[in-house]
């Protein structure tokens, strides 16, 4: 028997459904009788779903897997994981066995969309050019990590006093607070760009000062 | 209509600098960024940096950083790179190109027509 | 930096007939890429960007498709002036990257 998984990761969203796919070639004659089908964690070797001697024998892993049944006689050896969470990712092993065995791997890589930043400014009056600044940008819930990026208003990367921190919340989701301190020209563009590298999800903010007064500018 | 005009050719000494220049007209100068991009037979193009023609901050790929100076003079709406320590290896062709788009996602809709840089003793 | 690879380096085609460029990113640029034409005696011209968009004043025969890591050029029905060298560049972070140029010569 020759098991055949997807070779790229399986990228889901937190709290949404992943299938996990796998599958074999069954001979002709082939009862669900015959077969042996685990998934388990590739690394611990935690069962997670199996269906042995003919029957489903239900999921071992927080009871939200499934199988396909009615696809298995077909060599669907799929797996449905309910409710994506963090804690969800890595490696899962499909072993089929039949008269022979064979096992492959794959991966899952859960993520989640950042929401659009949050911008605030200190001080945020009496600003005149030459004085120092603190623009925070904030965004909340996303997974994995993000990249942050601070451009002006031409698109040229501000990389002077930037801290940026990324705290995990009880969930595993990230909040990211990053801090440019600057010193104010005339007017200008402050702009922080939070990108998922999963998602290839960008979200931004802006703030502009253009002499008086401060202004927040709405989405392109 | 929207225009670059590049400074001529150049025939320099190895070891000395070079400083050529890229004027914009036919629009607000200082509302583009402007891009310094080299054109070399052995590397094809190569982004050597960007330039905010308004605040002059300034950003440059790591290769260049320490051989290029960008600069810009609003007054003349005029971009100026400098080349520092020059070798045979900074002989190219050197253009300038507006920076057009939305944040964060910046082209080059308008390119100078390049200056010529030759190295040789 | 990210690598841009372009495909073919030379390419021969006759007025009229369709041709495509390729170009292959290192990793995944989501759909910002940008398609250059390079002729001699002209200054560099942006016929797309953002991976599909047709630049203002770009004739319809110019299209571009692809995301992610793989992109397509297509000049439907070439017409003499399209006899040219093409670049791809992304323009998805910095330090912006340029694919090493397709020669399309007159068959």
């Known amino acids: 028997v020759e098991v055949q998984v997807s070779e790229d990761p399986v990228v889901a969203l937190v709290d949404t459904d992943a299938t996990l796919r796998c599958s074999f070639s069954p001979e002709p004659g082939f009862s669900l009788a015959q077969l042996n089908l685990i998934w388990q964690l590739t690394d611990t070797k935690q069962l997670v779903h199996s269906f042995t001697e003919g029957r489903d024998q239900g999921s071992a892993y927080s009871n939200r897997t499934a199988l396909f049944p009615d696809l298995l006689v077909q060599g669907n050896a799929s797996l449905r994981l309910q409710r994506v969470r963090v804690t969800d990712e890595g490696s899962y092993t499909c072993f089929v066995s039949i008269q022979d065995f064979d096992s492959a791997a794959v991966s899952l890589q859960v993520a989640a969309p950042y929401s659009k930043p949050s911008m605030t400014l200190e001080p945020n009056k009496d600003l005149r050019p030459g004085n120092m600044v603190t623009i925070t940008c904030s965004s909340y819930q996303g997974y994995p990590e993000a990249e942050v990026f601070w451009k002006d208003g031409q698109g040229v990367p501000l990389t002077g006093n930037v801290t940026t921190s990324q705290m995990a919340n009880e969930r595993g989701l990230f909040d990211v607070h990053s801090v440019l301190r600057v010193v104010l020209g005339a007017n200008g563009t402050y702009s922080c760009l939070v990108r998922n590298p999963v998602l290839q999800q960008d979200a931004h903010g802006s703030v502009t000062i253009t002499g008086q007064p401060l202004t927040f500018p709405p989405e392109a | 209509e929207v225009q670059l005009q590049q400074s001529g050719p150049e025939l320099v000494r190895p070891g000395v600098s070079v400083k050529i220049s890229c004027k914009g007209s036919g629009y607000t100068f200082t509302d583009y960024a402007m891009h310094w991009v080299k054109q070399s037979h052995a590397k094809s193009l190569e982004w050597i940096g960007v330039i905010n023609t308004y605040s002059g901050n300034t950003y440059y790929s790591q290769k260049f950083k320490g051989k290029a100076t960008m600069t810009v003079d609003k007054s003349s709406s005029t971009a100026y790179m400098e080349l520092a320590r020059l070798t045979s290896e900074d002989s190219a062709i050197y253009y300038c190109a507006r920076g057009a788009g939305y944040f964060p996602y910046w082209y080059f809709d308008v390119w100078g027509a390049g200056t010529t840089v030759t190295v040789s003793s | 930096d990210i690598q841009m690879i372009q495909s073919p380096s030379y390419l021969a085609a006759s007025p009229g007939e369709t041709i495509t460029i390729n170009c292959r990113a290192s990793k995944s640029i989501s759909k910002y890429l940008a398609w250059y034409q390079e002729k001699p005696g002209k200054t560099n011209k942006l016929l797309i960007y953002?991976?599909?968009t047709l630049q203002s004043g770009i004739p319809s025969r110019f299209s571009g498709s692809g995301s992610g890591t793989d992109f397509t050029l297509t000049i439907s029905s070439l017409e003499p002036e399209d006899f040219a060298m093409y670049y791809c560049q992304q323009h998805y972070e910095y330090p912006y990257t340029f694919g090493g140029g397709t020669k399309l010569e007159i068959k």
């Open positions: 953002s991976g599909s």
